[in-house]
């Protein structure tokens, strides 16, 4: 037995993190995002579950909905109508995929304090929303869209062809939800609620993924999802717009697809209303290096939508795919025709451009060897955006304001010096006309949310400072974190290293690489987290490293597009290169190095283990992709092209985990997957296991019955406990 060294009395009262701390969420933090309802008011659910309206200007708060009313229907969410006469209450939440869920909705009349009776909403509803003005309701039920002029009115049925797993109206199918829209909805009200635009997805010809859901019955259920894998038939999308004032008059009108897009397979990527009679649609070729932004106008005489070729703006990438993870969306200015948009400049960095007539004549608003990440708001005189410019750390996010009313436009960093040590990674949420905004700081210190004046940027009040968390952490020995970079062959590899609390450079530590590494991802971020790897450093004395290699985002197109058409090569190489550099630092025990990852990270960790370098003793892959032929078309083809002979089939075949089965012989491999994974199908791990068995390679595996890609609930506890045992065994750490 070794007595623990006592440095001082204070340190003696400190304790290391435990796995239980992590699994119980003991050190989780809170953020505060105001639910803005005007320029100076927001709604917030109080600790005792009342819905409270705050007026910033007067400092007053009003309970608009009591917890009693919420509880009467077991409501877990709410939505105030813009005329403030009604609230929808959402209950019976039932998750479907990443964003989608069904629920039961009740409408509560605030003027008389009663639930609206008569013409109640059907159940369960797939999506429901208020019009942006007044209290019209649009909702999706059984894949069809319905409209109510007032909550108590009978519904008007807009679509009739909706059919489960075949035709989706106003909601996306699986692949559009996960890989294109990143929403549960596919309908959009015009700014004053005159028109309702919606997408129709026809999945009739899409091949279906089928998997067993074991449940508790004698026979398992089969889950069927139309899911286009790489190269398969894709959904057919159409966009319609209906006049909600007189919905029966002419009915839904289809918006034409630009000719250059319609000539081959294509996607719809987003819709942005500009005014009540002008709409902007974005389309993308199936080979995702050409995107077209089309501005369409309502023709009163014909009651149709006209999209002139002169209002088509083409965005094309010659070095990779169009955009970052998604093609960026435009933010229109007050003239209702010009807009601001983020895309690559001539030097290959994503920056804000102002487009007035043509993309060729775009005026570049930001520039430099860094990237603009998000445009939050454009007002008459200011543009608010986030970037990673400050002090040249790509893993930071600061909020900037550019004055667009003056020439030359002046730029001010709103957040750079607010709480410099504590806060280096921000997002923001703006009220109408950017009269006020909330800043949410995610770290590297304890997260804090603050309210600010939109004109002066003055802090008005702290919305959430996580005091309880701060107090709880006072007697915890947290690991040390550092973010640094490696320069290797003209490539900059940023890394985050998490070091044990009493880290001593003269000692040797086991190293765990945590990898994601997917295209346009970023793992090395200046954010606060107390998670599993924090525990591994704090209690188990491991060094953990995260490395952003080629293919990762926000450092320019050269790094981002390096992996184009070659997934599974450079991401792996860069993890290996980084490990070699870490060994050179002198404090890594090179006989105890492991790698783990989830999803894309599981793919990279598997390939790294099978790289034949002898660097890794063991590793874990959770829900890995094993062949790009098994993954979704929209995602996969964006980066890999098509799995056809005349396109990129060869690399599809070369980049599988199965092709490297033999190389797993000299590593300890733990393969984990949920059997009900709708995203990265269990098929991926089943094929790895089959290849390893056929190669007579020993490995460990764990499946989670009826669990999806997130392995949530009790599975999470089991998963992290199991992985901890595996790593401690691998690193010869006593249990």
């Amino acid at each position: 037995l070794r007595p623990s060294r006592v440095h001082n009395s204070e340190e003696n009262t400190m304790r290391a993190l435990t796995l239980k701390d992590i699994l119980n969420g003991t050190f989780s933090y809170k953020t505060f995002f105001p639910n803005w309802i005007s320029g100076q008011e927001y709604l917030h659910q109080s600790a005792d579950n009342n819905i409270v309206l705050y007026n910033i200007e007067t400092g007053q708060s009003y309970t608009i909905l009591s917890n009693r009313t919420m509880k009467s229907v077991n409501a877990s969410n709410y939505g105030l109508s813009p005329d403030r006469q009604f609230v929808y209450l959402e209950s019976d939440y039932s998750k479907l995929w990443r964003y989608s869920y069904t629920a039961t909705y009740y409408i509560y009349d605030l003027s008389n304090g009663e639930f609206v009776r008569g013409n109640e909403l059907p159940r369960p509803i797939q999506y429901l929303c208020w019009s942006p003005v007044g209290s019209k309701l649009a909702y999706v039920y059984q894949n069809n869209i319905y409209l109510k002029q007032r909550p108590g009115d009978p519904p008007f049925q807009i679509t009739f062809n909706g059919r489960e797993n075949k035709i989706f109206n106003g909601i996306p199918d699986w692949v559009y939800e996960e890989e294109m829209l990143a929403t549960k909805y596919a309908l959009w009200w015009s700014p004053n609620g005159k028109f309702l635009a919606y997408a129709e997805f026809n999945d009739t010809d899409i091949p279906v993924i089928a998997y067993s859901y074991y449940g508790d019955e004698q026979y398992p259920r089969t889950i069927n999802i139309p899911y286009p894998k790489a190269g398969a038939k894709n959904p057919v999308v159409r966009i319609f717009i209906i006049d909600t004032t007189y919905p029966a008059y002419v009915g839904p009108q289809e918006v034409p697809v630009p000719a250059m897009i319609a000539s081959s397979d294509y996607y719809f990527s987003w819709l942005t209303w500009v005014t009540d009679e002008r709409v902007c649609l974005q389309w993308l070729k199936r080979v995702q290096n050409v995107s077209v932004l089309s501005i369409c106008d309502f023709r009163e005489d014909w009651q149709t939508w006209d999209c002139p070729k002169t209002q088509e703006h083409i965005e094309e990438s010659r070095t990779g795919w169009a955009g970052g993870f998604f093609v960026s969306t435009p933010v229109f200015s007050y003239d209702a025709i010009s807009y601001y948009k983020i895309f690559s400049d001539k030097d290959g960095y994503k920056h804000i451009h102002y487009i007035k007539d043509t993309v060729e004549n775009a005026i570049q608003i930001t520039s430099g060897k860094w990237e603009a990440i998000n445009i939050f708001r454009v007002t008459q005189d200011s543009l608010f955006y986030s970037s990673n410019e400050f002090e040249e750390y790509p893993g930071r996010r600061n909020i900037y304001r550019i004055s667009i009313g003056s020439y030359p436009p002046s730029k001010k960093c709103v957040t750079c010096h607010l709480r410099k040590e504590r806060c280096q990674y921000y997002t923001a949420s703006f009220s109408d006309y950017a009269k006020y905004y909330a800043l949410v700081c995610y770290g590297p210190g304890i997260p804090i949310s603050t309210l600010h004046d939109g004109r002066t940027d003055q802090e008005i009040k702290i919305l959430e400072e996580n005091k309880e968390l701060e107090n709880a952490l006072k007697n915890i020995q947290l690991p040390k974190e550092e973010i640094k970079k490696l320069e290797v062959d003209e490539i900059t590899l940023w890394y985050k290293m998490i070091l044990p609390p009493q880290f001593d450079r003269s000692k040797k530590y086991p190293l765990l690489i945590q990898v994601y590494g997917g295209p346009c991802s970023q793992s090395v971020r200046s954010v606060f987290a107390v998670n599993w790897i924090s525990y591994l450093a704090s209690k188990e004395g491991m060094v953990i490293a995260l490395v952003d290699g080629r293919g990762t985002a926000f450092q320019g197109d050269k790094l981002l597009y390096a992996v184009y058409r070659k997934l599974g090569v450079y991401e792996v190489e860069d993890q290996i290169t980084a490990v070699r550099k870490f060994i050179e630092m002198g404090f890594i025990d090179e006989k105890r190095i492991a790698i783990w990852g989830w999803s894309y990270g599981g793919y990279v960790s598997s390939l790294a283990l099978a790289s034949g370098t002898g660097l890794f003793k063991c590793g874990i892959a959770v829900a890995p992709v094993s062949s790009w032929e098994y993954y979704a078309s929209v995602y996969t083809e964006r980066f890999m092209g098509l799995p056809t002979k005349d396109d990129n089939l060869e690399h599809y075949k070369n980049s599988t985990v199965m092709a490297r089965a033999e190389y797993f012989r000299n590593v300890d491999y733990l393969l984990i997957h949920g059997t009900a994974d709708d995203n990265v199908h269990f098929q991926n791990s089943a094929q790895i296991a089959k290849a390893l068995v056929n190669a007579q390679v020993d490995f460990q595996a764990m499946w989670y019955s009826d669990q999806n890609h997130g392995l949530s609930g009790l599975s999470t506890n089991h998963l992290y406990t199991h992985m901890t045992h595996f790593l401690k065994q691998c690193f010869s750490l006593s249990d």
Partner: antibody
Framework: QVQLKESGPGLVAPSQSLSITCTVS????????INWIRQPPGKGLEWLGL???????NYNSAFMSRLSISKDNSKSQVFLKMNSLQTDDTAIYYC?????????????WGQGTSVTVSS | DIVMTQSHKFMSTSVGDRVSITCKAS??????VAWYQQKPGQSPKLLIY???YRYTGVPDRFTGSGSGTDFTFTISSVQAEDLAVYYC?????????FGGGTKLEIK
């Protein structure tokens, strides 16, 4: 149901002060603002001031020096006190509810109490 | 203070007619304008708030529109019971101010 009822003296001598009580029912004063508005005979409406949910007040600058509004949440009562009344302060005085659900417009009015300033 | 001007003190109309009352603000009040109806011997009643939102229980013949400085209140088909004085009011900032009122008379 929502009700506001003003009770006042009816007659006030010039240079004296006016006190009116507004008793509300059907809602809580912690959740709504109460405005005071007056209407001289045959004339239009004039906003005097308000008391917010939290107890803060805001007065029309024309009455700032002689007006005070207070309340007792537990008794559901709001009080208006105005000093140094003159004959042109003769009016119907209304207490009126306001709040964010109608964008701080005035959704419920009391029946008003008639105040005559005369010697 | 923001001055609200109702240009017509009186308006004469017939049952079934469409009538519009205008109100002008001395400065931009966004959409923070309300319209009230006051019948003889009664307290005012809220009809329209935030320029265009009809208050609960108000018949749909009453509508409001406008933003910035110019606002309109319309009765699409005047009924005999609509005989009243109509006031506009800005609820944009304190002090809240009212227009002078427009008396609607039935011919």
């Amino acid at each position: 149901q929502v009700q506001l009822k003003e009770s006042g003296p009816g007659l006030v001598a010039p240079s004296q002060s006016l006190s009116i009580t507004c008793t509300v029912s059907g809602f809580s004063l912690t959740n709504y603002d109460i405005n005071w508005i007056r209407q001289p005979p045959g004339k239009g409406l004039e906003w005097l001031g308000l008391i917010w949910t939290g107890g803060g007040t805001n007065y029309n600058s024309a009455f700032m020096s002689r007006l005070s509004i207070s309340k007792d949440n537990s008794k559901s009562q709001v009080f208006l006190k105005m000093n140094s009344l003159q004959t042109d302060d003769t009016a119907i005085y209304y207490c009126v509810r306001g709040g964010p659900l109608v964008w701080y417009a005035l959704d419920y009015w009391g029946q008003g109490t008639s105040v005559t300033v005369s010697s | 203070d923001i001055v609200m001007t109702q240009s017509h003190k009186f308006m004469s109309t017939s049952v079934g007619d469409r009538v519009s009352i205008t109100c002008k603000a001395s400065q931009d009040v966004s959409t923070a304008v309300a319209w009230y109806q006051q019948k003889p011997g009664q307290s005012p009643k809220l009809l329209i708030y935030s320029a265009s939102y009809r208050y609960t229980g108000v018949p749909d013949r009453f509508t409001g529109s406008g933003s910035g400085t110019d606002f309109t209140f319309t009765i699409s088909s005047v009924q005999a019971e609509d005989l009243a004085v109509y006031y506009c009011q800005q609820h944009y900032s304190n002090p809240r101010t009212f227009g002078g009122g427009t008396k609607l008379e039935i011919k």
